[in-house]
Interface confidence: medium
């Protein structure tokens, strides 16, 4: 009789990465798909994703940017990592066997493990890894932009396929590391001046600097994270117009 047993922390802090393991006994993990499913208190079931014993994965699009699954056939285990936790991630998490590629039902389930996301315990945490997919090509333009202080400048980033809003913008000054400006296409990173704004979804995105300041002369990169692996645009250098 196949049995599944979830293990992991019961209490985690907001923003932490949840790491759960499912141990399969009474049968081999090989040649099956394995899934994670969750159920918030008093709510319905939500499919998180699945993994085959080869390591290939498919994730629920609504969670894709936060989920990573892996499998260890030598231990008869598979695991889930869910990052950037919020209170909305509080749920019972089930692991289940996904019968086969065509029918897609779940014939064996673990007992479930209650995960509570609360500032009452746990560590701090971060992001997950997206699912599989072909490499997305990005065209950033222009490659060079000459402007004066006070100008409004616009940088474009075009994708070879739809990436929803999974796009970030970075600023890099000579000899320095890149700095995050915008994430999720339009969300301003904490501490970044409001003259920076991002827009777009699908395949076309724009970074706008509304009133260029002297410290804004730098190189700007877009980066997609809808599809594995993450890829960057070629960069746009914003230089002072003489």
């Amino acid at each position: 009789q196949v049995q599944l047993q979830e293990s992991g922390p019961g209490l985690v802090k907001p923003s932490e990465t949840l790491s759960l393991t499912c141990t399969v006994s009474g049968g081999s993990i090989s040649n099956y798909y394995w899934s994670w499913i969750r159920q918030p208190a008093g709510k319905g079931l939500e499919w998180i994703g699945r993994i085959y014993t080869s390591g290939s994965t498919n994730y629920n699009p609504s969670l894709k940017s936060r989920v990573t699954m892996s499998v260890d056939t030598s231990k008869n285990q598979f695991s889930l990592k869910l990052s950037s936790l919020t209170a909305a991630d509080t749920a019972i998490y089930y692991c289940a066997r996904y019968y086969d590629i065509l029918t897609g039902f779940f014939d064996y389930w673990g007992q479930g493990t209650l995960v509570t996301v609360s500032s009452g315990g746990g560590g701090s945490g971060g992001g997950g890894s997206g699912g599989g997919g072909s490499v997305i090509w990005m065209t950033q333009s222009p490659s060079l932009l000459s402007a004066s202080t006070g100008d409004s400048v616009t940088i474009s980033c075009r994708m070879s396929q739809d990436i929803s809003s999974y796009l970030a913008w970075y600023q890099q000054k000579p000899g320095k590391a890149p700095e995050l400006l915008i994430y999720a296409a339009s969300s301003l990173q904490s501490g970044v001046p409001s003259r920076f704004s991002g827009s777009g979804s699908g395949t076309d995105f724009t970074l706008t600097i509304s009133s260029l300041q002297s410290e804004d002369f730098a190189t700007y990169y877009c980066q997609q994270y809808d599809s594995f692996p993450p890829t960057f645009g070629q960069g746009t250098k914003v230089e002072f117009k003489r």
């Epitope: 790491s19 940017s65 029918t103 897609g104 039902f105 560590g123 701090s124 945490g125 971060g126 969300s187």
Partner: antibody, heavy 118, light 113 residues
């Protein structure tokens, strides 16, 4: 305050290996994915791979499989990247960077320059 | 993504009577000559248990008073006759291979009078 301290510049011969380090402070090292990014002189950014220090789970861009090996030492909150079989095209600045929610990279190390020359 | 709408949200049935739960999909879940709709029973504090797979196939060990029917977008779970032990929440679930997205209905709570 989140900070990363990367190891110093490396000069290596073709065919050799180097191991770069990135010491993290100011947050729970085991709870965030650490990424590595390559930047050749005058060029753009290339994602190499990522590691979850909590359990050592590492993922690589296809291009860097066999070239880069990512590890992490929880006790010292340090991430490592070993680059093997070095060639001139491996001359670059390598950054460690923390992945936050939405897979965006919020904090970066100062970069380590690797020069491959005979 | 395919959306599954279950009705009713709750249902009170007398012992020995028939209980009928409906699940409607926003688009067809039929392909490969099968209906990719499955039904689960969930009791408090327990994980869901597979009852019916591929719309009408009874999972091994499940009593024959449970049956499933339907195709394309409209599916039904029937319990006849209802027993006291059947008080639970019932979920439908579909598998649509493209875009690799699997969804559950909102659940139907069955109470026994």
């Amino acid at each position: 305050q989140v900070q990363f301290q990367q190891s110093g510049a490396e000069l290596a011969r073709p065919g050799a290996s180097v191991k770069l380090s990135c010491k993290a402070s100011g947050y729970t090292f085991t709870s965030y994915w650490m990424q590595w990014v390559k930047q050749r002189p005058g060029q753009g950014l290339e994602w190499i791979g990522t590691i979850y220090p909590g359990d050592g789970d590492a993922r690589y861009s296809q291009k860097f499989k066999g070239k880069a090996t990512l590890t992490a030492d929880k006790s010292s909150s340090t991430a490592y990247m070993q680059l093997s079989s070095l060639a001139s095209e491996d001359s670059a600045v390598y950054y460690c960077t923390r992945r936050r929610g939405y897979d965006a990279m919020d904090y970066w190390g100062q970069g380590t320059s690797v020069t491959v020359s005979s | 993504n395919i959306v599954l709408t279950q009705s009713p949200a709750s249902l009170a049935v007398s012992l020995g009577q028939r209980a009928t739960i409906s699940c409607r999909a926003s688009e067809s879940v039929d392909s490969y000559g099968s209906s990719f709709m499955h039904w689960y029973q969930e009791k408090p504090g327990q994980p869901p248990k597979l009852l019916i797979f591929l719309a009408s196939n009874l999972e091994s060990g499940v009593p024959a008073r449970f049956s499933g029917s339907g195709s394309r977008t409209d599916f039904t779970l029937t319990i006849d006759p209802v027993e006291a032990d059947d008080a639970a929440t019932y979920y439908c679930q579909q598998n649509n291979e493209d875009p690799n997205m699997y969804t559950f209905g909102g659940g139907t709570k069955l109470e026994i009078r």
